[in-house]
Interface confidence: medium
C-alpha cells in the first residue's frame, strides 16, 4: 500500500512566517503547527490559510488573543475585508507553553486540534483550494510546519467529532523532534516478509509494498489506548516491530508488552518518576528479574516524540529508540512464534504502529 | 517490493560538484538509515556516508567529510548526496543502500550511477 | 577508524570444495560484522550479518562466525553461481569499513 507523499516540513521557521502548500489545500489534508508560546512579548498570535503572500485573501485566520481572560478570534478577510468574527471563548495555549496545533481540512470544514483535543471547526466561507500559502505571525516561536497528505482507505473520521460548547482541554502534548547525537548506525537483517501497518499519522511520504494482509489503519489521532494487535505469524529471528508516538508532558510511566497467551515474554517499561527503562518478563503472573542498564542516559522525554524499534533476533530483542540501539533483553520465553500480541498503554499518544 | 534507484551520476571536472538522488520505493523511508557506498574501477567497496531521516543524524567517511553532503526529503522518499570540489579519486560507481534496524547491515542496495571525475 | 583486513585477496576452488575466507578487525568490533557478495556490473548482496546471523533467502551453505577479532565466511560446498568476490564489513562504530575482497574463481 503506498501512501501519497506529503510536503516537507518547515523546520524552526522564523516568525513572521510565510510558505507555500504545496498542491494547495486538499480535502483531507492535515497540517501540524507546532511551537512554543513566546511569555514576553505581545498577547497575540495568529495563523493564516491564505491566498498567497499579501493577506488580503484570508480563508481561515486562526487568531489566539492573551487578552480578556483569553479567546481565539477566527475569520475570513476577502479582498482586504474582515468578515464577521466567530469568537471561542475559551483559551488552550497557555503563554510560555509549547503547542500542537493540527488543522483537518474537510469538504465543509476546517477542524482544530490543539494538543491532541478538537477545538473548533470552522466552516468554509470561500473555497478552500484556493488556500496555497500558510503563514504565522505574533507572538510565538514555531518548531515546526508539517503537511500529512489524505491518506487512501480512511477507517474513519480523522477527528472525531466533539460538541463545540463541550472543549476538553489536556496539558500540551508537543511532538518537536529532540535534537540528536551526531550518527549512529543503521540497519540489519532480513526483508520483512509481512507487514502490517497500524498508523495514525502517517510520515511524510512514507511508502508501503503491499502486505499479504492489508494494513490496519487508525488514523490520527484515534489510537486507542491501551492498544492491543495481533503480530501475526508470531516473533522469529528478523521479525521487526516498529511504534512511533509522543510521551505526554506529564507522563509516568509507559509499557510496551509483548505476549504469549497469559505471559508477558518481554515488558519495556520507562518510568519517568524514576528515569528508568525497565524490562522484564511475566510468567504466570510472575515478574522475573528486572534490568535497568542503559548505555546512555535515558532516551524518552516528557513531552517529546519517539521511535522505537524491536527487532527480534534468535537469542535476543535488539531495542533502539530514535535511531539508535539502546539495549539488548535476552529471550526468556523462547518459543518465539507464540509471542503474538503487542500490547501498549500508559502515558503516550501512539501515531504509527508496524508489526 | 523494496527498491533503491540511484541517478545523477556523469562526467564532471575536478573541483566541480554533482548531486546524485537515490529514490526510494516499498518502506517506510523515514525509518530507515540509507547509505551510499562507492566502488572505483576495478576496487573494492567504500562506505561514504549515511543518514536517518527520522532523526536526521549523518556520518561520513573521512575521505569525504566537508566536501560532500548526504540529505534526506522524506516528502519525496529521496536521499541525496551532495558531491562538491570533487577529486580524480572520487570516480566510482556510487550505491545507495538500505540500512536496517541501527545497525550498519545494508541489506537492500541500488543498481548504482557512474561518477567520472575527469578534465 | 577501524580496518579490516581480509585474506587471502582471492582465491581458486573447484564446485564442491569447501571455501573459507577470513577477515581480522584491528580493534574490537563485537559482532557487528557482515558478509556480502558481489557479481561483476552488480550491486553486493548481503550473506550474513551480526557475524553468524544467515540472511533471509541466502542459501545455508554460507555460514559465518566470530573468534574475538576474526571473522570467517564459510561456504561449506561451492556452486557454480558462488563464483563472485565476497567482502567483509564492520558496522560497530559510527563509520563503516569494508574488507578489501576476496575474489573467488574457478580453478
Known amino acids: 500500500m503506498a501512501f501519497s507523499g506529503s510536503q516537507a516540513p518547515y523546520l524552526s521557521p522564523a516568525v513572521p512566517f510565510s510558505g507555500t502548500i504545496q498542491g494547495g489545500l486538499q480535502d483531507g489534508l492535515q497540517i501540524t503547527v507546532n511551537g512554543t508560546v513566546l511569555s514576553s512579548s505581545g498577547t497575540r498570535f495568529a495563523v493564516n490559510f491564505q491566498t498567497g503572500f499579501s493577506g488580503n485573501d484570508i480563508a481561515f485566520h486562526f487568531n489566539p488573543r492573551f487578552e480578556d481572560g483569553g479567546y481565539v478570534v477566527c475569520n475570513t478577510r476577502q479582498n482586504g475585508s474582515w468578515g464577521p468574527e466567530e469568537r471561542k471563548t475559551h483559551m488552550p495555549f497557555q503563554k510560555g507553553m509549547p503547542f500542537d496545533l493540527c488543522f483537518l481540512v474537510q469538504s465543509s470544514d476546517f477542524k482544530v486540534m490543539v494538543n491532541g483535543i478538537l477545538f473548533v471547526q470552522y466552516f468554509h466561507r470561500v473555497p478552500f483550494h484556493r488556500v496555497d500559502t500558510i503563514s504565522v505571525n505574533g507572538s510565538v516561536q514555531l518548531s515546526y510546519i508539517s503537511f500529512q497528505n489524505p491518506r487512501t482507505v480512511p477507517v474513519q473520521p480523522a477527528f472525531s467529532t466533539v460538541p463545540f460548547s463541550q472543549p476538553v482541554c489536556f496539558p500540551p502534548r508537543p511532538r518537536g523532534r529532540r535534537q540528536k547525537p551526531p550518527g549512529v548506525w543503521p540497519a540489519n537483517p532480513a526483508p520483512i516478509t509481512q507487514t502490517v501497518i497500524h498508523t495514525v499519522q502517517s510520515a511524510p511520504g512514507q511508502m508501503f509494498s503491499t502486505p499479504a494482509i492489508p494494513p490496519m489503519m487508525y488514523p490520527h489521532p484515534a489510537y486507542p489506548m491501551p492498544f492491543i494487535t495481533t503480530i501475526l505469524g508470531g516473533l522469529y529471528p528478523s521479525k521487526s516491530i516498529l511504534l512511533s508516538g509522543t510521551v505526554l508532558p506529564s507522563a509516568q510511566r509507559f509499557h510496551i508488552n509483548l505476549c504469549s497467551g497469559n505471559h508477558i515474554a518481554f515488558h519495556l517499561n520507562p518510568r519517568f518518576d524514576e528515569n528508568a527503562v525497565v524490562r522484564n518478563t511475566q510468567i504466570d503472573n510472575s515478574w522475573g528479574s528486572e534490568e535497568r542498564s542503559l548505555p546512555r542516559k535515558m532516551p524518552f522525554v516528557r513531552g517529546q516524540s519517539f521511535s522505537v524499534w524491536i527487532l527480534c533476533e534468535a537469542h535476543c530483542l535488539k531495542v533502539a529508540v530514535d535511531g539508535q540501539h539502546l539495549f539488548e533483553y535476552y529471550h526468556r520465553l523462547r518459543n518465539l512464534p507464540t509471542i503474538n500480541r503487542l500490547e501498549v498503554g500508559g502515558d503516550i499518544q501512539l501515531t504509527h504502529v508496524q508489526t | 517490493e523494496v527498491q533503491l534507484v540511484e541517478s545523477g551520476g556523469g562526467l564532471v571536472q575536478p573541483g566541480g560538484s554533482l548531486r546524485l538522488s537515490c529514490a526510494a520505493s516499498?518502506?517506510?523511508?523515514?525509518?530507515?538509515?540509507i547509505h551510499w557506498v562507492r566502488q572505483a574501477p576495478g576496487k573494492g567497496l567504500e562506505w561514504v556516508a549515511g543518514?536517518?531521516?527520522?532523526?536526521?543524524?549523518?556520518s561520513y567517511a573521512d575521505s569525504v567529510k566537508g566536501r560532500f553532503t548526504i540529505s534526506a526529503d522524506t516528502s519525496k522518499n529521496t536521499a541525496y548526496l551532495q558531491m562538491n570540489s570533487l577529486r580524480a579519486e572520487d570516480t566510482a560507481v556510487y550505491y545507495c543502500?538500505?540500512?536496517?534496524?541501527?545497525?550498519?547491515?545494508?541489506?537492500?542496495w541500488g543498481q548504482g550511477t557512474l561518477v567520472t571525475v575527469s578534465s | 577508524d577501524i580496518q579490516m583486513t581480509q585474506s587471502p585477496s582471492s582465491l581458486s576452488a573447484s564446485v564442491g570444495d569447501r571455501v573459507t575466507i577470513t577477515c581480522r578487525a584491528s580493534?574490537?568490533?563485537?559482532?557487528?560484522v557482515a558478509w556480502y557478495q558481489q557479481k561483476p556490473g552488480k550491486a553486493p548482496k548481503l550473506l550474513i550479518y551480526?557475524?553468524?546471523s544467515l540472511y533471509s533467502g541466502v542459501p545455508s551453505r554460507f555460514s559465518g562466525s566470530r573468534s574475538g577479532t576474526d571473522f570467517t565466511l564459510t561456504i561449506s560446498s561451492l556452486q557454480p553461481e558462488d563464483f563472485a568476490t565476497y567482502y567483509c564489513?564492520?558496522?560497530?562504530?559510527?563509520?563503516?569499513?569494508f574488507g578489501q575482497g576476496t575474489k573467488v574463481e574457478i580453478k
Open positions: 543502500a538500505r540500512g536496517y534496524y541501527v545497525e550498519g547491515v545494508l541489506d537492500y
Open positions: 516499498g518502506f517506510t523511508f523515514r525509518y530507515y538509515y
Open positions: 564489513q564492520q558496522y560497530y562504530g559510527s563509520l563503516a569499513t
Open positions: 543518514i536517518y531521516p527520522y532523526g536526521g543524524y549523518t
Open positions: 580493534q574490537s568490533v563485537s559482532s557487528a
Open positions: 551480526s557475524a553468524s
